[in-house]
Structures are given as structure tokens and as C-alpha cells.
């Protein structure tokens, strides 16, 4: 049966890195430059991915595998196989339609990507603000006022003058 199949379809003998050339009596021809075939028995070779602009080559194309791209410094990959590059922002910023913008008051972003997120509302958990939030950092919630009764904790309670989540001016 294997011999019969080979007689019927000579292309099945063409290994990865080649294609079955109909113009040359279906003999196996090497993939042309800048193309590849990752499996055997292929009738065409695929064009290699080109990493251009903000994309840079992470792995060169070979006759049997496609090129792989990543992003130039200042950008990070999005999508399967790094199909997109998104500009980094600084911590404390987010990418908007007008480029990188500082997080609004009451929000933070501790990464170079993603969106600004609201500070934790400590009072929802019955806790108090131990460390105020900034554009780059979330607030740190401390023990609840009840936990701060004498002898219950060694943590110094925060100064009472600020509302929860407010960063110092």
C-alpha cells in the first residue's frame, strides 16, 4: 500500500524544506530563497515572515521553519506569535488615543503596558490606608481600626487627616 501510494502521489515523498514541483514532473525542489515548508508533501513553499519597522527578527527563516519576530525596545508583543507591537509607556501611565498619558488621580499602573486601575478601596474591607497610593503604586491597606486597639498590633495607625486612597500632593 505504501508503494502504491507513492506511485499515485510522488509528492508525498518530498520532505520539509522542499516542494513538489509540478513544472518539473513533480520532483522535489528546494524551497526558493525567503520561503519555507515546515511539513513534507507540500506543493508550494510559504513566504517567510519579514520583521520590519518596529518588528525585529528573533529567529531567522530557514527552509523548514518561518521567521519569528519580536518588538524593538520601547514596544512589547501583542497577539499570537507577536502579530502586533504596542508602544510601552512609563509606569504611572497608560496608552491612549493621544499616546502615553499619566494615570488620573485615584488610579495607578505599575507596569509599562496595560491600563490605569483604581486604587484599592481599603474601607470596603473594613481596613484603613497604611500607605497612600500614587500613579505608579496601589494604596497599601492596613489593619482595621478595631485591630489597632492597645496591645492588638504594633502597627502605627495612619495620620487621620487624609481620606482613603489620596496620594500626597
Amino acid at each position: 500500500f505504501e508503494r502504491t501510494r507513492s506511485l499515485q502521489d510522488p509528492c508525498s515523498n518530498c520532505p520539509a524544506g522542499t516542494f513538489c514541483d509540478n513544472n518539473r514532473n513533480q520532483i522535489c525542489s528546494p524551497c526558493p530563497p525567503n520561503s519555507f515548508s515546515s511539513a513534507g508533501g507540500q506543493r508550494t513553499c510559504d513566504i517567510c515572515r519579514q520583521c520590519k519597522g518596529v518588528f525585529r527578527t528573533r529567529k531567522e527563516c530557514s527552509s523548514t521553519s518561518n521567521a519569528e519576530c519580536d518588538c524593538t525596545p520601547g514596544f512589547h508583543c501583542l497577539g499570537a506569535g507577536c502579530s502586533m507591537c504596542e508602544q510601552d509607556c512609563k509606569q504611572g501611565q497608560e496608552l491612549t488615543k493621544k499616546g502615553c498619558k499619566d494615570c488620573c488621580f485615584g488610579t495607578f499602573n505599575d507596569q509599562k503596558r496595560g491600563i490605569c486601575r483604581p486604587w484599592t478601596n481599603c474601607s470596603l474591607d473594613g481596613k484603613s490606608v497604611l500607605v497612600n497610593g500614587t500613579k505608579e503604586r496601589d494604596v497599601v491597606c492596613g489593619p482595621s481600626p478595631a485591630d489597632l486597639s492597645p496591645g492588638a498590633s504594633s502597627v502605627t495607625p495612619p495620620a487621620p487627616a487624609r481620606e482613603p486612597g489620596h496620594s500626597p500632593q
Epitope: C69, F75, M84, C85, L95, T96
Partner: nanobody, 122 residues
Framework: EVQLVESGGGLIQPGGSLRLSCAAS????????MSWARQAPGKGFEWVSS???????YYVESVKGRFTISRDNSKNTLYLQMNSLRAEDTAVYYC????????????????WGQGTLVTVSS
């Protein structure tokens, strides 16, 4: 074959003006959003400005009020008018077909030109 060819770069004194052009061919320019990006010496790419097929424009904060992006669909050409140039505008400027329509985000299928160097120095 898709081609984007930038021109108009050069040496200019601070405060001066330049107009960059990008001649496009091999794709439907009029229905494509386009962008300018730049790469300063030894630094990463930075998105500069984008224009939708509708003509709506966006700019990075640092060039707003100084740079103007425009397009002439009859000539398949993208422009970047740069006024009040500063030393920090020194970079290679690239035009690109912009598929994602998301500021600061590029797609692997976007087309890029080879770039034109703008040097702002006295």
C-alpha cells in the same frame, strides 16, 4: 509591489521647518490609515502621528501644535509638516501603512518605508 518612499529630510537649525513626503504605491492608499514614526539615534521607535482615511489626525504630545500630518490621495502621498524644530526631534522618520487603527500599535502586515534622516542642530 508595495513601496513607501520618504523624502524631505536634512540638516536644519533649531526653530526651522521641514516638510517630509512619503510616496506610496502598490496598495489602496486612499482607504488606508497612515502614520509617521521616528527613531532617534540609539533609541527605540516612537509613534509620532497618524491620519485615518477620513482625515482624522492624532499626534504624540511632544509634537502637538508643531507638526501637521496630511495626505493627498490624488498623489498617493503622505506629508509631515514640521515647524519649530528642536534638537530632540533629531531622528530617522518613517512612514507606515497603519492597519491596527490603535495609536502606538503596529501590525505585522503594516508596510514601512526606509526612512529619512532629520537632523536639528545649530
Amino acid at each position: 509591489e508595495v513601496q513607501l518612499v520618504e523624502s524631505g529630510g536634512g540638516l536644519i537649525q533649531p526653530g526651522g521647518s521641514l516638510r517630509l513626503s512619503c510616496a506610496a504605491s502598490g496598495f489602496t492608499f486612499s482607504s488606508s490609515a497612515m502614520s509617521w514614526a521616528r527613531q532617534a539615534p540609539g533609541k527605540g521607535f516612537e509613534w509620532v502621528s497618524s491620519i485615518y482615511s477620513s482625515g482624522k489626525t492624532y499626534y504624540v504630545e511632544s509634537v502637538k501644535g508643531r507638526f501637521t500630518i496630511s495626505r493627498d490621495n490624488s498623489k498617493n502621498t503622505l506629508y509631515l509638516q514640521m515647524n519649530s524644530l528642536r534638537a530632540e526631534d533629531t531622528a530617522v522618520y518613517y512612514c507606515a501603512r497603519w492597519k491596527t487603527l490603535r495609536v502606538g500599535v503596529w501590525d505585522e502586515s503594516d508596510y514601512w518605508g526606509q526612512g529619512t534622516l532629520v537632523t536639528v542642530s545649530s
